[in-house]
């Protein structure tokens, strides 16, 4: 396992005449981002074939607005590396596609527009753990400068990230037959478990006893280069060392077809068969369409039927970005209540609730009243993970077992006297007041200000509050 790292140094007009127009304008500010696609081997695969080694998308670069009249400079770039993790062995030879995308930020209807500015492709040999390799690629009038490397993730080491390193068991040296792990000299190579004789440079294994070959090598022990084991070339003199025919010069030598195009000879010259998304004599003109599948994570691509028209990705819920490349962290809005733990599973949002809570967002208190009785006719109320009793009149305490003094709160108004009663309390009102709590003044003409006294009771009589 390891990581392929790509560092973009500059993207701008290439040398020579015909400098490109700036991709951004005062009316349409824009910013760049990059996409890299990696495939194992020196394959002639079409551009739309899957990025079997992996793919990565950069962050957006700073917003850029063209200065009127100024030539297009190198454009401002996103920060950081593009990193493509690989799980298995590093193949040693690989194909890459690097796309430069423009996001227009003008006030257009329907949101920003995205378009492919340039796409470069190439095939390279690269050993893991080596230094940064520098490269320059041109696409039309644009020039892209970049560096790349492959590095192993511990405990893997070696040119293919297939050797394993382990901390030393003894302080000074490795066990019998085991070498120190350069550059980690304080660690030792783990015991080899591949088939005996399996080439350490060109073979690797994931199961004990097997020997699997890196691209370009074959044979039971991965010691035979593919180029010398299949003598199929139709031209040229014989090679004494290999017994194979060595090709002489031809119009397709050096592959004049750019961006992964394949070359075939014609009676007069050559012809390029371009991968989807490219056209021109040498496949040098690029344009991306919905057929190229630019939308990630199940995004729906609309528009972009031909390379000259833009497309838009309609992203499924939970994804954003011009190519639906960014997963949204819905847990950042803290949807789980009562201290629940939020889990964004992509297809759904889940809350892991603390004890005492339930529901899809931990919004329900569990029934704290189960098996808990409130005495003397009290009713149980759940809340906050603990039960509480709402007691009947005349009772109090946690379980309504304590007899309450109903007169303690001085419920009788206007100087009325309070008497405790088996069913509550009774107020004996002072002259001139009436009501259950002596709250109503009696008018001089004998009429009360609010409800009349019940039949059989005269103003001033003690009234029982039920």
């Amino acid at each position: 396992a390891g990581v392929f790292e790509l560092q973009i140094h500059s993207f701008g007009p290439g040398p020579g005449p015909g400098a490109p127009r700036s991709p951004c304008s005062a009316r349409l500010p824009c910013r760049l981002f990059f996409r890299v696609c990696l495939k194992p081997g020196l394959s002639e695969e079409a551009a739309e074939s899957p990025c079997a080694l992996g793919a990565a998308l950069s962050a957006r670069g700073p917003v850029y607005t063209e200065q009127p009249g100024a030539p297009a400079p190198d454009l401002p770039l996103p920060d950081g590396l593009l990193q493509v993790p690989f799980r298995d062995a590093w193949p040693g030879t690989f194909s890459f596609i690097i796309e430069t995308w423009r996001e227009e930020l003008g006030d257009q209807i329907g949101g920003p527009a995205w378009s492919l500015l340039a796409r470069v492709a190439g095939r390279r040999r690269l050993a893991a753990g080596g230094p940064w390799a520098r490269d320059i690629q041109r696409a039309g009038a644009w020039e892209l400068r970049f560096s790349y490397r492959a590095r192993c993730e511990p405990p893997a080491v070696g040119t293919a990230c297939t050797r394993l390193c382990r901390p030393r068991s003894a302080p000074s040296r490795c066990g019998p037959g085991l070498r120190p792990c350069a550059p980690l000299e304080d660690e030792c190579e783990a015991p080899l478990v591949c088939r005996a004789g399996c080439s350490p440079e060109h073979g690797f294994c994931e199961q004990p006893g097997e020997c699997r070959c890196l691209e370009g090598w074959t044979g039971p022990l991965c010691t035979v280069p593919v180029s010398t084991s299949s003598c199929l070339s139709p031209r040229g003199p014989s090679s004494a060392t290999t017994g194979c025919l060595v090709p002489g010069p031809g119009p397709c030598d050096g592959n004049p077809c750019a961006n992964g195009g394949s070359c075939s000879e014609t009676p007069r010259s050559f012809e390029c068969t371009c991968p989807r998304g490219f056209y021109g004599l040498r496949c040098e003109v690029s344009g991306v369409t919905c057929a190229d599948g630019p939308c990630f994570n199940g995004g729906l691509c609309v528009g972009g039927a031909d390379p000259d028209s833009a497309y838009i990705c309609h992203c499924p819920p939970g994804f954003q970005g011009s190519n639906c490349e960014k997963r949204v962290d819905r847990c950042s809005l803290q949807p789980c209540r009562n201290g629940g733990l939020c889990l964004d599973l992509g297809h759904a949002l889940r809350c892991r609730c603390r004890a005492g809570f339930a529901g899809p967002r931990c919004e329900h208190d569990l029934d704290d009243c189960a098996g808990r009785a409130c005495a003397n006719g009290g009713t149980c109320v759940e809340g906050g993970g603990a039960h509480r009793c709402s007691c009947a009149l005349g009772f109090g305490g946690r379980d309504c077992r304590e007899r309450a003094d109903p007169c303690a709160a001085r419920p009788c108004a206007h100087g009325g006297r309070c008497y405790a009663h088996f069913s509550g309390l009774v107020c004996a009102c002072a002259p001139g007041y009436m009501g259950a709590r002596c709250e109503f003044p009696v008018h001089p003409d004998g009429a009360s200000a609010l409800p009349a006294a019940p039949p059989g009771l005269r103003p001033g009589d003690p009234q029982r509050y039920l």
Epitope: V328, P360, R361
Partner: nanobody, 115 residues
């Protein structure tokens, strides 16, 4: 079904202000959480406990408010910077009844801040 309708996006000079609004409609029992995202990250919102939460990059410049009667949140954006340029998406976690909750997204509204 629930819909989120956004409004208020547009083109503004750096240092200027805009107000984004998002109204939820449809089968709504209660709104659990609601806020605004851009480029996949939370900008500002109300959590399920009712507190306002802001991204560090907008604190002191953006203010979120709510109108529970209208099932609506409003994002007041002041002192806008070019780096605030983005499509702003309204998002809401909504109960359609007592036991069913789903996450909903608006279509997005573009905010462009010119230098």
């Amino acid at each position: 079904q629930v819909q989120l309708q956004e409004s208020g996006g547009g083109l503004v000079q750096a240092g200027g202000s805009l107000t984004l609004s998002c109204a939820a409609s449809g089968s709504i029992f209660s709104i659990n959480a609601m806020g605004w995202y851009r480029q996949g990250d939370l900008v500002a919102g109300f959590t399920s406990e009712g507190s306002a939460k802001y991204a560090d990059s907008v604190k002191g410049r953006f203010t979120i408010s709510r109108d529970d009667a209208k099932n609506m949140v409003t994002l007041q954006m002041n002192s806008l910077k070019p780096e605030d340029t983005a499509v702003y998406y309204c998002a809401a976690d909504i109960f359609s009844d007592r036991d069913h909750v789903d996450w909903y997204w608006g279509q997005g509204t573009l905010v462009t801040v010119k230098p």
